[in-house]
């Protein structure tokens, strides 16, 4: 922590300017008035302070705004944003997308994923929902950042906004996030024709239930293996060999390559070996012919 000293008269600061780069940390602490700093935050990012000097300026702002910085300050943080922790950002109320853009630009190339995720969360809370403008900003300035939002926050996305989401924006989304987004996408694209619908819905299929995957198998979609591998395990296990063959079309041969990986491995274990043999791929591990399959889960549910 910076020691408290009194400011020498010749070092008194009346405006935030480049002369401050010659100040030692204790001089900055003693001589820079926090209210002046806040009022002239727009100047700070043009001044080549050292990382250590920025620590002092952050400390000043923290003392002035213990409940969190106002947006007028946040908007002009610039490189000072790199000093912020998720705990700092959690105190903020951000509504402006210009603020979000400015800080996303600064964070580029730095390990700031936790801070960026918290910032986006604060923007969604501040704006009341994840509207189209916010999604557009995220896809333009922070591809993949959509997936940093919690399922609860993603639930505020109106289906009408889903069309603005690109496949690469969903690359890092987990199953719980896709569970939330998939029904919205299904609703958003429901009036499209078969092939056009599949192209649009494909990035969201990691959240699709079995019945929807079964329905796709009847539509000659020729699902690629990468998409198949992202389907929920629970959605894949009930599919028959015939349904998987129809779903994948010419891509069915890829099952051999993915034989040892979930969900393919788990699906193979649930199929009769003679059904698997009809694919002619040499898939092994199915239920041997003549074995009876008892589904004990059904019996437990009845008792």
């Amino acid at each position: 922590d910076v020691e408290r000293t009194t400011c020498p008269p010749e070092k008194e600061v009346h405006e935030i300017d480049e002369s401050l780069i010659f100040y030692k940390k204790r001089e900055l602490e003693a001589c820079v008035d926090a209210a002046l700093l806040a009022a002239q935050m727009d100047r700070v990012d043009a001044i080549p302070f050292t990382y250590e000097q920025l620590d002092v300026l952050k400390h000043k702002l923290d003392e002035l705004y213990p409940q969190g910085y106002p947006e007028s300050v946040i908007r002009h943080l610039g490189h000072l944003f790199l000093k912020m922790s998720p705990e700092d950002i959690r105190k903020w109320n951000v509504t402006s997308l210009e603020t979000l853009k400015a800080l996303l630009k600064v964070s580029k190339g730095h390990e700031m994923s936790a801070q960026v995720a918290t910032l986006i969360d604060r923007v969604v809370v501040g704006r009341g929902q994840l509207d189209k403008d916010t999604v557009d900003t995220l896809t333009a300035f922070c591809p993949g950042c959509l997936c940093s939002l919690s399922p609860e926050r993603l639930s505020s996305v109106p289906p009408s906004v889903i069309g603005a989401v690109r496949p690469q924006d969903l690359d890092t989304c987990g199953p719980r996030q896709l569970d939330v987004l998939y029904p919205k996408a299904r609703l958003a694209f429901q009036n499209m024709s078969g092939s056009e619908y599949f192209v649009k819905i494909r990035p969201f299929l990691g959240g699709a239930p079995t019945e929807d995957v079964k329905a796709l198998s009847q539509q000659n979609v020729s699902m690629d293996l990468a998409t198949f591998m992202k389907l929920r395990r629970e959605a894949v296990l009930p599919l028959t060999v015939a349904e998987v063959q129809k779903l994948l079309g010419p891509h069915v041969e890829g099952l051999k390559v993915e034989e040892q990986h979930s969900p393919v491995r788990d699906w193979i274990l649930k199929q009769r070996q003679d059904d698997l043999d009809t694919l002619g791929l040499g898939l092994q591990g199915g239920i041997p012919n003549g074995y009876l399959i008892l589904d004990l889960s059904v019996r437990e549910a009845l008792s």
Epitope: I47, P48, F49, G78, H79
Partner: nanobody, 116 residues
């Protein structure tokens, strides 16, 4: 990321002189605003002693005014710090820095020791 290599440090008697050099790997060097910093001991704060902008305009810390001169040779991608009338309090590791907001990369520094 630009590489900066400082040199020219050494042991010198109080009242003596040294000339430090800092060479940058960046081709657009002439546009850079450069500074020399001094760190008295490991873990202590680096303090700015002199700056030179792309137009050759210079600024100095009060403690070195009249004794140190910063200059640059854009053809050689190099900035210099001529240090005269050295005092024991000038002892430390000297680093050059491209004075660019958000640039926190430093060279390895060059040690200057002034014995009284």
């Amino acid at each position: 990321q630009v590489q900066l290599v400082e040199s020219g440090g050494g042991l010198v008697q109080a009242g003596g002189s040294l000339r430090l050099s800092c060479t940058a790997s960046e081709s657009g060097f002439s546009a850079n605003y450069m500074g020399w910093y001094r760190q008295e001991a490991p873990g202590k704060e680096r303090e700015l002693v002199a700056t030179i902008n792309r137009f050759g305009s210079t600024n100095y810390a009060d403690s070195v005014k009249g004794r140190f001169t910063i200059s640059r040779d854009n053809a050689k991608n190099t900035v210099y710090l001529q240090m005269n009338s050295l005092k024991s309090e000038d002892t430390g590791v000297y680093y050059c820095r491209i004075m660019r907001p958000g640039n926190w990369y430093w060279g390895q520094g060059t040690q200057v020791t002034v014995s009284s």
